[in-house]
Interface confidence: low
């Protein structure tokens, strides 16, 4: 009977870690000679299995090839890895007496596609916090997937963003692939509660995409608005000054009261008020004993937020010398300050 080597499947897909069978049947055992499995073609092809009884990790013949009438030379590869991807050929050789065995026929080849899941996407952002209206880049990386086809999308608070760049490497054929995508986001002051999501869809994920999340609270700084106001006097000898730092993030805040440029009180906020947008407010009260001041006094509220340069607001309290009523004091904000509030 004429020899024919048949590999019925053009391709098989297998998930990493699973087993696959590569089928190969012959129509004749003649001429005498071995059957071998190779991956690839040409001089660099790799011998996979030769039915010579030797132990090959993860590969077994499916049927008993020692039987005289066996025509089935299929093999099972177990615990498949992305490195097993490629085209496998079942090849019949004619045994040589003195010279090497001669290849006389090959099957058509079976391509093994190894389906490997992408790793959970990791989203990284800038090392330093950005400020509202600044553009910052986020990068999403996932690796180890196969085949190469993959979809990556970016979202911010449910709205799709377009990436600056998305690359899948390597560009040629490979056992597995990596994806990297960068998106640029415009920060705004309401972003403390916002999230940037990188979503990866792949054939191995069965319509359940993987997601990587970056909380913008880790990447944004909202500087406080600072106001100094005078409250109604609680008694004849006292003036209440209030320094209010509003809508800041993160929580790191130091507040110092100064009298005529000299530190009067260090205030380390403990009970911050949280706003619905995720930012914080803090109010510091400073009780001024009016009887202690006959001259004008400039009170300064100095706010240091998140290691940034201090924000200062001045408020001048007029001493008794300016007042006809000995039981009261006058105050007004310093009009020479860069920013003034009444």
């Amino acid at each position: 009977k004429e020899l024919k080597v048949t590999q019925p499947e053009k391709s098989v897909s297998v998930a990493a870690g699973d087993s696959t069978v590569l089928n190969c049947t012959l129509t004749s055992l003649l001429p005498v000679g071995p059957i071998r499995w190779y991956r690839g073609v040409g001089p660099s092809r790799l011998l996979i299995y030769s039915f010579a009884g030797e132990y090959v990790p993860r590969i077994r013949n499916v049927s008993d090839t020692t039987k005289r009438n066996n025509m089935d030379f299929s093999i099972r590869i177990s615990n498949v890895t992305p490195a097993d991807a490629g085209i496998y050929y079942c090849v019949k050789f004619q045994k040589g007496s003195s010279e090497p065995d001669t290849e006389i026929q090959s099957g058509g080849g079976t391509e093994v596609y190894v389906l490997a899941k992408p790793s959970p996407p990791e989203v990284s952002g800038p090392a330093d916090r950005g400020i509202p209206d600044q553009k910052v880049n986020f990068t999403c990386k996932s690796h180890g997937f196969s085949p190469r086809n993959i979809t990556l999308k970016w979202f911010k608070d449910g709205q799709e963003l377009h990436p600056l760049e998305t690359t899948v490497n390597p560009s040629g054929k490979n056992v597995s692939y990596n994806i990297s995508s960068t998106v640029r986001v415009v920060l705004n002051s309401m972003d403390v509660n916002s999230k940037v999501i990188c979503e990866v869809a792949h054939i191995t994920l069965d319509r359940s995409p993987l997601r990587g999340i970056a909380n913008l609270s880790n990447f944004i700084r909202v500087s406080p608005t600072v106001k100094v106001t005078q409250q109604s006097p609680t008694s004849m000898n006292q003036v209440n000054l209030t320094c209010r730092a509003e809508r800041f993030y993160p929580e790191d805040l130091q507040l110092i009261w100064l009298e005529n440029g000299n530190v009067s009180r260090n205030d380390t906020p403990k009970n911050l008020t949280k706003n619905t947008d995720g930012t914080y407010n803090y109010t510091s009260l400073f009780l001024v004993n009016s009887s202690a001041h006959r001259e004008d006094v400039v009170f300064t509220c100095q706010v240091k937020h998140d290691q940034q340069p201090a924000i200062t607001r001045n408020h001048t309290v007029l001493g008794f010398a300016h007042s006809s009523d000995q039981g009261s004091m006058q105050t007004f904000p310093d009009n020479n300050a860069t920013h003034n509030w009444n």
Partner: antibody
């Protein structure tokens, strides 16, 4: 290749709303990857960015014009539009639409349309 | 807003000359800077993006460099068709802002 074409009235009366449309040909707004922008140029002056829109409707506006500007997109017609309300003579300019890629700048521009605000 | 200061505002050079235009940002904008060419009566044309990348189809005599606050645009050998006004534009911070322009003329 992608081409942009502005259209709209060349003369608008003060206090009225300026309306312009940019028609995109040779490519789909919905394909993503780009913002679609409006820029203007006052006579003999430099360029001023008005705002940009993504196909999903996400917009960015120049704060100096934000209270008067609306940019919208109609993906079915492959168009995006600019509305500028309460115009004055200071809004007289050449108005350009452009395609904006963050990584590639404003790489495609319309030829521009002159809008004069006058009674 | 980020202020973009371009200099000079105009220049005159001979064909074949090397022409340099500078653009200074009021704060650090990394490499988020584009350069455009605008000929009279025409729309601007993108020449350089991300400070130093040549846009598609732009002759190699045009180049850009710089990062942070100081940027340079160079025409290595001025050609008659290069008569135009050149603008820088930052896209690091909203709103996007342009330089005042540099008008290039032939002597």
């Amino acid at each position: 290749q992608v081409q942009l074409q502005e259209s709209g009235p060349g003369l608008v009366k003060p206090s009225q709303t300026l309306s312009l449309t940019c028609t995109v040909s040779g490519g789909s707004i919905s394909s993503g990857g780009y913002y679609w922008s409006w820029i203007r140029q006052h006579p003999g002056k430099g360029l001023e960015w008005i705002g940009s829109i993504y196909y999903s409707g996400s917009t960015y506006y120049n704060p100096s014009l934000k209270s008067r500007v609306t940019i919208s997109v109609d993906t079915s017609k492959n168009q995006f539009s600019l509305k500028l309300s309460s115009v004055t003579a200071a809004d007289t300019a050449v108005y350009y639409c452009a395609r904006e890629g963050y990584h590639s700048g404003m790489d495609v521009w319309g030829q521009g349309t002159t809008v004069t605000v006058s009674s | 807003d980020i202020q973009m200061t371009q200099s000079p505002s105009s220049l005159s050079a001979s064909v074949g000359d090397r022409v340099t235009i500078t653009c200074q940002a009021s704060q650090d904008i990394s490499n988020y800077l584009n350069w455009y060419q605008q000929k009279p009566g025409k729309a601007p044309k993108l020449l350089i993006y991300d400070a130093s990348n040549l846009a598609t189809g732009v002759p190699s005599r045009f180049s850009g460099s710089g990062s942070g606050t100081d940027f340079t645009f160079t025409i290595s050998s001025l050609q008659p068709e290069d008569i135009a006004t050149y603008y820088c534009q930052q896209f690091a911070y909203l709103p996007w802002t342009f330089g005042g322009g540099t008008k290039v003329e032939i002597k």
